[in-house]
Each structure stands twice: as C-alpha cells, then as structure tokens.
C-alpha cells in the first residue's frame, strides 16, 4: 500500500512483497526489501526509534537506495504496520503483517502488564480497547468486571478489528473497574492484557466561596474560607488559592471530597483556607481556583481587616423621611462597623418591637404608614464587643392627602327650601394643610341629563363644565367665607364655608382641596324645593336608644297625600338623569313608613317617630307630597345619622405634681363619649365641692385650686360617667412649705 502524495520526480518506494497484508507463522523469519530513488528508512511496530535488537535493517548489496528489514523468529507482538519511507517526506509504502501466534493471539504493548482506557459517560461516545490481534479473523469478546459482563460484536456499535481493537459504547463499561479482550481458538481461551477503566469527567459547574461577601474581621481573629466546587461525576479537582500574604505562616489548607446523595449527578469538592491570627496585611482579595484539567473556574471575595472593633453611622443616613399615608416606609440603618452592630429602634423614646405592621431590623419598615407613625425615631447601634454606642434621630413626617369629612357615599342629599339662606361646609383634614380650597358649581339639570356619561359610585355626578363660584350668573348668589381652622376630634382641620344668600336654583356645588401630596373633593347636591319641609325634633343628631321625630310640614292649600318613606339600598348602576334626587320618579326604592298626621291653621304635619333609635335607622328619609292642582309629586329628602353610643373615655393623663403653699393648681380632664358624660371631681374619694378656693369650669372639665394650703394635699380623681359607665383618672398633689398663720386667710373647706 502506498501512503503520501505522488511527486512528479519521485516514485513511491517499492516493497519486495507486493501486498497490503501479509500473514506469517510465529518463529519464521520476516524479510522485506524496499527500493527507491533516494535515501530510505524503515518504521516497524512497537519500536519507532530503531533501537530494537532483534530487527536488522541492512543496505542491499545490489544497488543504491535499497534497504532490507529482517526479523528472525517473529512473535505475535511483531504484528503491525511496516513502513518504508523517503527521509524528510511523507512518501511511504506500508505493509501490514500478521504474525499468527495461536498461543498469544493478542499483541501486547511493550512492557505493559496492564493498559488504561479513558472513557466519558456519554451515550454517544465509543471507546476503543486497543487489544490488537496477531490473527485477522479471530472471534473476540470483551470481558468487563466487576460484576462480570461479556460483550460480543453485534455488527453495529460493538465490533473488533485486529488493527484497531475492540470498539464499544463507553457508557456500557463505565461501571467496570477493568476490561480485557478474550479470543476462542479451538476451544481454548486467550486473554489480552488487563485494561483499567478510568472514567473521566471535566466539567465544573461552579465554584462558590463561603462566606461569599462582606467578610470583616479585626486583627487577631481567625479567617475561615470555604471554597466548594460542584462538578459532574468522575472529575478530579485541583484547588489553588491566591491572597494578599500567600507566604502566611499561620495558613492551613484542607481539601476534601464532600459526600453527595446517591443518584446525584453531581460531585462536590471542598477546600478550606484557615488563617489564625489575621493581620492588617492579610486584607485584600482572596481567590479560589478549582481545576479539573480541562476546565478551571475561580471565585473571589474581599476580606477586610480592621484594627479594632468599631461602630459609626454611614454618610447616607437620613435625618428626615417624608411619606404619604398608606405608603410603605423603609428607613435603613446605614452603618460602618465591625462586627455588625446590634440595632435597636425607638419611637419617642419607646423601644419598637417587630409585628405585622412594623419590622424593626437593619431597616425599619412600616408596612402601611399612618399619621400616628409621625414622630422621631432613634436608632441605636451597639458594638457587640466594645459595647460602644452610636445613636441617630430620624424624623418621620407622614403627609395626608386632603380628606373631606362630610364626604359620603352616593345618596340623594337633603333638599333645601326655596328662598332660604343656606350654608354649605367642607371640613378638610390634610397634612400639610391644604394650600387652597376652591368652590365650583353647576346647574343640576346640566349635570344630570347627559345620557352620554356613565355614573359610577366614585363619580356620582358626571359633570364636566364646573364653573367657579365667583361666576354665579344664572345660579344662586354666593359668598365664600374665609377659611377657618378648628380642632375637631383632636385634629387640626380647615373649614371652608359657602353661603347661599337665597336658595333659588337647584345646583351642584363642589369643594376641592389640594395639598402637596394630593387632592380631595366633595360634591354637594343642592336641591331647591318649594314643597314640604322636613325638621328634626329634637333638632340634633340622635344617639342610639334616644327617641327622635321627623316632621314633614306642607301648606295644606297646595299639597295633599303626605307620606313618609325610607330610601332603600339603591340598585347600581344608577341611570343618568335620575340624579341627584331621583326618588320621586322611582318609588320602587322606597319603603313606606307609618306616621301620624297633625294639622294647624295652615299646614299639615306628618310626624314619623323613631323610639329607641338604632344604627339601622340611619339613612335617607323621604317625605312625598302631591300638588292638589297638577297632581305632580314633590319629594323632600333628609339624611338621618344616628350616633353610636360610646362609653366614656378620658383623654390625657392627670399628672402627679408638687406645688408650694400659696401657689395655684390648674388641671383639666377632657372626657368624650356618647351620650356626653358628666364630669365629677373627688379628693381622697370624697366629692369635691366648689367654694371660693376651688373653681370648676367648662362643665367641670377644668379644676383650679387657688392659694393652696397643706390640707389640699391628697389624691385627686376625675370621673366621667354616663349611662354606659364611668372612666376615671387620678393624680397625687403634694404641697410643700410651711403654713402661714394669718387671721385674714379665709380658705375653702372640704366636705
């Protein structure tokens, strides 16, 4: 056989045996002569360097450029390719020689007691076990152990070739520790050398350092860094570390394989770097590299070494945090320190504990901030080693978008008697207070009769063309009073009032309040009627269990058929055009009520009495009257609110106090509740009676003791009582100093 590229000037070397394959018996002599046109050399199996003693290469006697290769007493191991080539070229002729040695059918590698086959666990990969044959047509099988398994050529992926060896898919023998080839000749078995199976993997999935970041120590402490490499199976790992003082005398490195669950397709290796008694020069970047040979991965972390433990606030620590009601507020404690400090949060001096609304940790988190969260928050950092403390105050300001107190769900609001003067009010609560409250108006019919507009609960009035109240052309004459500020329910509120000089036209009025975080609005339906008039007896909002009467008064000469109704829950959606007071057109939503009729000289009065009013009695009450001439129905609506009964409570504490003889004591006791409670004062459990020195004012809310004497010392109790019970607060008044004796002193006496 010829190998190499043909040359114009050179013919391939010519062999004396003109065959591709030569088969000879063992112990015979192999002799091949090679002739050519320039210097020739021979290469033969098992020894490519020409130092083999048994092989003789001699110059031919009969010509130039001719060499004869002779091997006396050939053995099976001489089987292989014999190549004659021109020096410094690729031009060569090759003959493959089989030395048939039935006692040794497999060719053994020189000095090999065993071989090694490297395989990867891959379904698509095949491996060749190089058990070459000295006979071309042997029946060869492959034996793997342990457990013992035999593989026979299948004409497909398993085969044996005398020049190449045994080919088999690598995964089939990946379990085995060793394999060998076996040939059967005349019922006799012959085995090749053993081949150790080495399954090689190489892929490293990742290298992870632990701790992975933020490593801080102080001088003298111990550093322990773990480096974990996760790899595919059958991988070996080399670890190496790089760090600032690699020559460290206190350094210790331990490498080990980690146990992984059986069935896992992953292996873990761990390298641990330990430095005892760390120094400042050990600060810096620590890198761990893991390498399988074909793949290297590394990971780094920075180790900071402090001279000593310390704690300080970071420059980004805020002093003022602004938020809007309902938002989530996060106030991080930004610090520098080693070791990490203990963090404690306080509000107005009281420690904060985490619960479902607040999380007090490295970050103070208020889930849904409310006004009551406004205040000063103090964060105290404590170094756990040195016990050094640092504190910082953060002011939290919670803003509230304008909320209009009278704003309620859609309901036809009260009707107003024609020609009367009326005051409309918007009470606005906002933080910061609204920078403006504007009033707008629109005629009722302009707003209610546009079928193109849909009405929703949130926007009951589909009005677009709002006009400023300064422009009251075609409407009611209006005057807007200057905003007033009032303390209502303990909150500073802004009250804006609009005075309608004469109620002539049905209209809608809107007040709009705006502050830095939002806006609020209220639409008031101002329905003017010439019809009946509703009054409340007594003329105040009733409390539960009190009685109240609703009086409907109508001119007897104009109206007839007075009837009381209660407005039931309205079906949604409400059709446009029925607003704002559609009750007369839609009697389906009304519940007829029992009432008593009275008359005087000019009017009929229909009285609907609610005995023991309950919260369920709240709602819109409609008085319906019919025009005697036109038979047109007129409706008047009155919204009734029933106040809930609330047991007395006293806001604010009476405080113990020390006063000198002759001075005055002034204390107040503010009680709330419904019905409003009665306030009484006691001294040493006896009722306190007013006299010249003891003054009770504002329904007993304020107590003044003038020119105190020693006998005024004692336990003072403020008690607020109603039918729902009592609440009380106590304080001890201490009187200091010597009593002056004087005949002029006319002081109060206690009973």
């Amino acid at each position: 056989a010829s190998v190499g590229l043909p040359s114009v000037s050179l013919d391939l070397p010519r062999l004396s045996i003109q065959k591709d394959i030569l088969t000879i018996k063992a112990n015979t002599t192999l002799q091949i002569t090679c002739r050519g046109q320039r210097d020739l050399d021979w290469l033969w199996p098992n020894n490519q360097s020409g130092s083999e003693q048994r092989v003789e290469v001699t110059e031919c006697s009969d010509g130039l450029f001719c060499k004869t290769l002779t091997i006396p007493k050939v053995i099976g191991n001489d089987t292989g390719a014999y190549k004659c080539f021109y020096r410094e070229t690729d031009l060569a002729s090759v003959i493959y020689v089989y030395v048939q040695d039935y006692r040794s059918p497999f060719i053994a590698s020189v000095s090999d007691q065993h071989g090694v086959v490297y395989i990867t666990e891959n379904k698509n990969k095949t491996v060749v076990i190089p058990c070459l044959g000295s006979i071309s047509n042997l029946n060869v099988s492959l034996c793997a152990r342990y457990p013992e398994k035999r593989f026979v050529p299948d004409g497909n992926r398993i085969s044996w070739d005398s020049k190449k060896g045994f080919t088999i898919p690598s995964y089939m023998i990946s379990y085995a520790g060793m394999v060998f080839c076996e040939a059967k000749i005349n019922d006799e078995s012959y085995q090749s050398i053993m081949y150790i199976v080495v399954v090689v993997g190489y892929r490293i999935y990742d290298v992870v350092l632990s701790p992975s970041h933020g490593i801080e120590l102080s001088v003298g402490e111990k550093l322990v860094l773990n480096c974990t490499a996760r790899t595919e199976l059958n991988v070996g790992i080399d670890f190496n570390w790089e760090y600032p003082s690699s020559k460290h005398q206190h350094k210790k490195l331990v490498n080990r394989d980690l146990k992984t669950q059986s069935g896992s397709e992953m292996k873990k290796f761990l390298s641990t770097l330990t430095i005892d008694g760390i120094t400042r020069s050990d600060q810096g970047l620590y890198t761990c590299a893991a390498s399988s040979g074909l793949m290297t991965k590394k990971n780094s972390t920075f180790v900071r070494v402090h001279e000593k433990p310390f704690v300080a606030f970071g420059s980004g620590m805020e002093s003022l945090v602004e938020a809007t009601v309902g938002e989530r507020v996060r106030i991080p404690a930004k610090y520098l320190g080693y070791p990490p400090p203990e963090i404690k949060w306080y509000k107005n001096g009281i420690p904060l504990e985490s619960n479902h609304t607040i999380k007090a940790g490295h970050v103070l988190t208020i889930m849904e901030v409310s006004e009551r969260d406004t205040g000063n928050y103090t964060v105290i950092l404590t170094n756990p080693i040195s016990k050094e403390k640092q504190s910082h105050v953060v002011s939290l300001v919670v803003y509230v978008p304008p909320q209009i107190g009278e704003k309620s769900l859609i309901s036809p609001v009260d009707s107003y008697q024609y020609g009367t003067t009326q005051t409309l009010t918007c009470t606005v609560y906002a933080i910061p207070p609204p920078h403006h409250i504007h009033w707008y108006w629109q005629l009722e019919e302009e707003c209610a009769n546009e079928p193109s507009h849909a009405v929703s609960v949130t926007n009951p009035y589909p009005c677009e063309e709002w006009r400023s109240v300064e422009d009251f052309q075609g409407g009611n004459k209006i005057e807007v009073n200057k905003n007033q500020f009032a303390l209502i329910e303990g909150k500073n509120k802004t009250v804006s009032t609009l005075v309608i000089q004469a109620a002539n036209v049905s209209a809608l009025y809107k007040c709009e309040a705006v502050n830095k975080v939002g806006r609020g609005e209220r639409v008031i339906s101002f329905h003017v009627t010439r019809g009946p008039e509703i009054t409340l007896q007594p003329d105040m909002q009733p409390t539960e269990q009190e009685s109240v009467s609703l009086w409907c008064t109508a001119d007897r000469s104009t109206f007839e058929n007075l009837t009381w109704y209660k407005l039931g829950p309205q079906p949604l959606p409400i059709h446009v055009g029925e607003l704002p007071t559609p009750v007369c057109k839609n009697l389906d939503t009304l519940w007829k009520l029992n009432a008593t009729m009275f008359s005087n000289s000019t009017n009929d009065i229909l009285i609907m009495e609610l005995k023991n009013a309950s919260l369920q009695d709240q709602g819109d009450y409609v008085c319906l009257a019919q025009d005697r001439k036109t038979k047109k129905r007129h409706c008047v609506v009155r919204q009734l609110t029933v106040l809930e009964r609330v047991a007395p409570t006293i806001t604010g504490n009476l405080e113990n106090q020390t006063t000198s003889i002759g001075e005055s004591i002034e204390v107040s006791c503010t009680a709330s509740g419904n019905p409003p409670p009665q306030i009484m004062w006691f001294k040493d459990n006896e009722t306190l009676v007013e006299d010249s020195g003891i003054v009770l004012k504002d329904g007993n809310r304020n107590l003044t003791i003038r020119r105190v004497r020693k006998e005024d010392e004692g336990l003072y109790t403020c008690q607020a009582c109603s039918v729902l019970g009592c609440a009380k607060v106590e304080a001890f008044f201490i009187i200091e100093g010597a009593q002056e004796k004087t005949n002029l002193e006319h002081h109060h006496h206690h009973h």
Partner: antibody, heavy 117, light 112 residues
Framework: EVQLVESGGGLVKPGGSLRLSCAAS????????MSWVRQAPGKRLEWVAS????????YYADSVKGRFTISRDNAKNTLYLQMNSLRAEDTAVYYC??????????WGHGTTLTVSS | DIVITQDELSLPVTFGESVSISCRSS???????????LNWFLQRPGQSPQLLIY???TRASGVSDRFSGSGSGTDFTLKISRVEAEDVGIYYC?????????FGSGTKLEIK
C-alpha cells in the same frame, strides 16, 4: 500584561524526542489551567493536551496519548510538553494557551516543530 | 468525536459591509445547564488565535461590539458588522461540550 512565550521547537527525526516550554508572565500562573494546541501547515487547530492548576490532572488527544506528557512548574511559571516517539504527522506550530472556564483566553505566539528524517 | 464544519473556506468582503460566518456541529452543543458551549476565534495573519466569543454569544473582554454570535444547538453564526482592515484573518469555531474539544476548519475573511 499577560504573556505566553513558547520555546524548544525545532527539527527532529521520526521516533525522536523533544521538550517544549512555555514561560508565563503577567498573571498568577498557578490559578489557571494550561493547554497545548497545535496547527499543522494548512490544517485546522487541534487540541493536544491540558493540565490542571496543580498539575494533578492531565488530558491528551488520542493522537498523542502515550507519547506526549504535559507538566507544569508553578514555581517557575512554566508549562512543558515532553514529546517522544515523534512522527511526521506531529509537524505543526505548537501554541500554549491559558484556560479559564474551558476557554482559551490567551495564546502564545507558537513554536514550530518539524519531524523529518 | 464531535465534528465541527465550516463550509466556507474563504469569504471575500468589502470594508464597511456586514458579513456572517457559519459553523455547524455534528451534535447539539446545548448542554444540560442551558448554556451553548461554542467559541469563536480569530487568527490574524502571522499571529496566534484570539478568543472573540464564548458560550455562543458572549463577547470576550476587549472585543468590539461589531462582533456578535448567535445560533441554535447545532448551527451557529458569527456576524461582523462594518468590516474593518483589522478583521482580516481566519475565523475558527470550537466546541467545548464534549472532550476532546474540536475546532472547525476555519473560514478566511479577505478583502475583495
């Protein structure tokens, strides 16, 4: 600046031996896997051998297995390739390459080996 | 072994135009970790190879954003936009999904 400089190439007879060296500088040699890649005249690049950072694990192409040995001396920042039983088909330019994540991110300029009698 | 094929031996191109070099693998290079282990190298005339792209589409550090890699499990493309003089050379693709790592035969980018 990362530098890899190969040396030791030359002309050798078939069956002969040779040792290639690769001197590394500009990076921490002991933290990178190293490989040899060769390119025969007019042929594609062929991976030859690789070694782990500590030298414990080595891999070879089938074509050189049993004849070539890759090794490293981390103290000298040097990579070696001992080549025995050389054949004409081993003739090529031999590059040493630095490996990270399996990628050969830096290569030397190469040294030429010619196997010829 | 995985065979990497680069069909175009050479690609003549004009400065400033865009060019795509293709590469095919005999087996999917999408590994079970979801990454595609294909690299692109450039060997400029008389120089050693330089890593351009790894994991199919990630540019090596210092490589111009004019180079971009894309592909599926077996078919890959290296796109060079606005070709410059320094882009001339042989482009090799290489698989890293299975040992031994194999290279393509190379595609020579030359100026028309």
């Amino acid at each position: 600046e990362v530098q890899l400089v190969e040396s030791g190439g030359g002309l050798v007879k078939p069956g002969g031996s040779l040792r290639l060296s690769c001197a590394a500088s500009g990076f921490t040699f002991s933290m990178y896997g190293m490989s040899w890649v060769r390119q025969a005249p007019g042929k594609r690049l062929e991976w030859v051998a690789s070694i782990s950072i500590g030298g414990s694990y080595t891999y070879y192409a089938d074509s050189v297995k049993g004849r070539f040995t890759i090794s490293r001396d981390n103290a000298k920042n040097t990579l070696y390739l001992q080549m025995n039983s050389l054949r004409a088909e081993d003739t090529a330019v031999y590059y040493c390459a630095r490996e990270m994540d399996g990628n050969y991110d830096y290569w030397g300029h190469g040294t030429t080996l010619t196997v010829s009698s | 072994d995985i065979v990497i094929t680069q069909d175009e031996l050479s690609l003549p191109v004009t400065f400033g135009e865009s060019v795509s070099i293709s590469c095919r693998s005999s087996k999917s290079l999408l590994y079970k970790d979801g990454k595609t282990y294909l690299n692109w190298f450039l060997q400029r005339p008389g120089q050693s190879p330089q890593l351009l792209i790894y994991l199919m589409s990630t540019r090596a550090s210092g490589v111009s954003d004019r180079f971009s890699g894309s592909g599926s499990g077996t078919d890959f493309t290296l796109k060079i936009s606005r070709v410059e003089a320094e882009d001339v050379g042989i482009y090799y693709c290489q698989q890293l999904v299975e040992y031994p790592f194999t290279f393509g035969s190379g595609t020579k980018l030359e100026i028309k």
